[in-house]
């Protein structure tokens, strides 16, 4: 494990301040999985403080990443069955040493909290937690103390007699009906927290505790590692046998001494303090979050978990932040719903991952016979007469631009518009002024301008009127034909669009 400044956080910070040497401690606290992580509830499942802490003295220019840490293992004894789900709280404390008022000063450097799932007897689970500028790398596992076994450290009954001979008030043991369930009466005074018994009048200690009544923590025992604690009145006995004498590790496990105790390296398929727990099989359901267990048909074969989307870890116990992979394209907002991933797309984009750009002509076509024009990374619709809006879906008001001159009144028409001219004006847009004698019509000219040749001018005006009439007739013919074509195209586009919408809704 390691504790130090996180990456990319500039110059490594020293955990000690300028007041001299310091030591780091880890406090590990286990709470039931149902408790609120943020609340200061009791460490109901257990708590422990790291021991064998080296002193860290700050030297100028020394990297904080190389700071010495407590003994690599922090053991937290827990009572009753292992719940599988728990809240893990790890606090990193600094003890400032040296001469200053009030003795040693304690400061909480960092506190990481997380809800975890872990089956007892499984492999080490690795984790990295960041808080502020600090980063903590650690591993954790749960192991059962005998006689508890299994993923939940259930205390199994000891074989006493056949169910037919179970005494009054006693019932057959589950899951072993050929045994009897009988409450053991431990030695009077045996610690209920740190001791247990399998036979009447005995007191066996959980790991980390010693003494006849299991009330003495191993770390605070006055005996040296090489001595065995005796009764309270006798102090220490002479050196007894070593922890590995007689090899306490079952099933071929190899024993190694660790700070006055022992640790068993178990062969594959066995777990527990003394390798007494046979391996987990797929039938035990070791894979969390619905993970698929493969292999592990018998205790000697290892299992592998195939995790559902959004989970990882050897037992699928860790949730992946799938949004950190930025699956939503084009600036879409990622939402990890746990059982699914959703992208909320920005305007102009669509699709499960916002991969479809609605702002290009490959997207939806312009409606009502409009044509799509691309340019500058965006698209716009050039709409047919009488239509407007982004996709030419809105009916345009041709009179909105006040096209009729000289106070003419505008009327919208299926093919465009018609101007009803004010008295004294004529023309498609009322642009011609009519002479008072009715002889001819002239374009409304600015005051002060005069026509030099009335005859030639009149001939020109008549020619213009004839051209305009011919143009209007030809225009109407063209419009009627194109409208028929446009309506057919529009119906096709509508059918295609309905199909697309249906497909999108189903997806």
């Amino acid at each position: 494990h390691s504790f130090g400044p996180g990456p990319g956080l500039g110059t490594p910070r020293s955990p000690c301040n300028a007041r001299g040497p310091c030591r780091l401690f880890f406090r590990v606290c286990l709470k039931p999985g149902v408790s609120q992580e943020a609340t200061e509830s009791l460490c109901a499942l257990g708590a422990a403080l790291s021991t064998s802490v080296p002193v860290y003295t700050e030297h100028p220019g020394e990297s904080a990443a190389a700071l010495p840490l407590p003994d690599g293992l922090v053991r937290v004894p827990f009572r009753d069955a292992w719940p599988g789900t728990f809240s893990l709280v790890i606090e990193t404390w600094r003890e400032q040493l040296g001469e200053h008022a009030g003795g040693p000063a304690w400061n909480l450097l960092a506190r990481v909290v997380g809800r975890r799932r872990l089956a007892a007897g499984g492999p080490w689970a690795r984790d990295v937690q960041r808080t502020g500028t600090w980063e903590l790398h650690f591993s954790y596992r749960a192991r059962c103390e005998p006689p508890a076994v299994g993923a939940a450290c259930a205390r199994l009954c000891r074989s006493r007699s056949a169910p037919s001979r179970c005494g009054p008030g006693l019932r057959p043991c589950t899951p072993f009906p050929d045994e009897c369930e009988a409450p053991s009466v431990c030695r009077p005074g045996c610690s209920p927290e740190h001791g247990y018994c399998e036979e009447p009048d005995e007191c066996r200690c959980l790991e980390g505790w010693t003494g006849p009544l299991c009330t003495v923590p191993v770390s605070t025992s006055s005996c040296l590692n090489s001595r065995v604690p005796g009764p309270a009145s006798t102090g220490c006995l002479l050196p007894g046998p070593g922890p590995c004498d007689g090899n306490p590790c079952a099933n071929g496990g190899s024993c190694s001494e660790t700070s006055g105790s022992f640790e068993c390296a178990c062969p594959r398929g066995f777990y527990g303090l003394r390798c007494e727990v046979s391996g987990v099989t797929c039938a035990d359901g070791p894979c969390f979050n619905g993970g698929l267990c493969v292999g592990g048909e018998d205790p000697d074969s290892a299992y592998v978990c195939h995790c559902p989307p959004g989970f990882q870890g050897s037992n699928c116990e860790k949730r992946v932040d799938r949004c950190s992979l930025q699956p939503c394209q084009n600036g879409g907002l990622c939402l990890d719903l746990g059982h699914a991933l959703r992208c909320r797309c920005r305007a102009g984009f669509a699709g499960p991952r916002c991969e479809h750009d609605l702002d290009d002509c490959a997207g939806r076509a312009c409606a009502n016979g409009g044509t799509c024009v691309e340019g500058g990374g965006s698209r716009r619709c050039s709409c047919a007469l009488g239509f407007g809006g982004r996709d030419c879906r809105e009916r345009a008001d041709p009179c909105a631009s006040r096209p009729c001159a000289h106070g003419g009144r505008c009327y919208a028409h299926f093919s465009g518009l018609v101007c009803a001219c004010a008295p004294g004006y004529m023309g498609v847009r009322c642009e011609f002024a009519v002479r008072p004698d009715g002889a001819d019509a002239v374009p409304a000219a600015p005051r002060g301008l005069r026509q030099a040749d009335p005859q030639r001018f009149l001939a020109g005006v008549i020619a213009v009127i004839v051209v305009v009439v011919i143009a209007i007739v030809a225009g109407i013919v063209v419009l009627v034909i194109s409208r028929k074509k446009r309506m057919a195209k529009y119906e096709k586009a509508e059918i295609k669009e309905m199909g697309e919408m249906h497909r999108e809704l189903n997806a």
Epitope: A119, A151, D284, P309, P352, A507
Partner: antibody, heavy 117, light 107 residues
């Protein structure tokens, strides 16, 4: 050996109710997500719903076609998962299977539900 | 929901033949695809998970491949006990959905 055994199927009228059970053996039942999957006569497989673990507050998820009508529950002490089916429709006629996990690794033999007037 | 389209819906083959069944997803499902075998009157059995991994106890003649939207189940040498209906299923997005099935019959 892992075994899942469904029961409770039968003939029921439209609008009626039925409760299916699935008893598991050979597995640590409380550690497994449980699902119901159905298969209409001559048709393919359709996921119906799922119930997760005690540590997940027994969270349930359902297919849109059964939401509000079907309810899944479990009794870990009895190694049993249930499917309560209300307001049954003719289209609910199918063989109902219980399965484990996210990937449907273990399956029961199925129980037949017929909804007909 | 993601649609899984299986083809063919049925096929006839002889013992020893190489059989290929395809499955197409309506959108990218990564490699979160499983294949199941179902014999008449029996429950389905998991054959392949993660698109290409054989489940415990599945013979090596069964293999799966593909990623994204196109997936394949191959039986390298068809055996008499392999005549059944095969289903693909996607597990990328909730809810899980299945293909319509492919019935493998004796020619």
């Amino acid at each position: 050996e892992v075994q899942l055994v469904e029961s409770g199927g039968g003939l029921v009228k439209p609008g009626g109710s039925l409760r299916l059970s699935c008893v598991a053996s050979g597995i640590t039942f409380s550690n497994f997500w449980m699902n119901w999957v159905r298969q209409a006569p001559g048709k393919g497989l359709e996921w119906v719903g799922q119930i997760r673990l005690k540590s997940d507050d027994y969270a349930t998820h359902y297919a849109e076609s059964v939401k509000g009508r079907f309810t899944i529950s479990r009794e870990d002490s009895k190694n049993t998962v249930y499917l309560q089916m209300n307001s049954l429709k003719t289209e609910d006629t199918a063989v109902y299977y219980c399965t484990t996990g996210y990937y449907f690794d273990y399956w029961g033999q199925g129980t037949t539900v017929t909804v007909s007037s | 929901n993601i649609q899984m389209t299986q083809s063919p819906s049925s096929l006839s083959a002889s013992v020893g033949d190489r059989v290929t069944i395809t499955c197409k997803a309506s959108e990218n499902v990564g490699t979160y695809v499983s294949w199941y075998q179902q014999k008449p009157g029996k429950s389905p059995k998991l054959l392949i998970y993660g698109a290409s991994n054989r489940y415990t106890g599945v013979p090596s003649r069964f293999s799966g491949s593909g990623s994204g939207t196109d997936f394949t189940l191959t039986i390298s040498s068809l055996q008499p006990e392999d005549f059944a209906t095969y289903y693909c299923g996607q597990f990328y997005s909730f809810p899980s959905t299945f293909g319509g099935g492919t019935k493998v019959e004796i020619k």
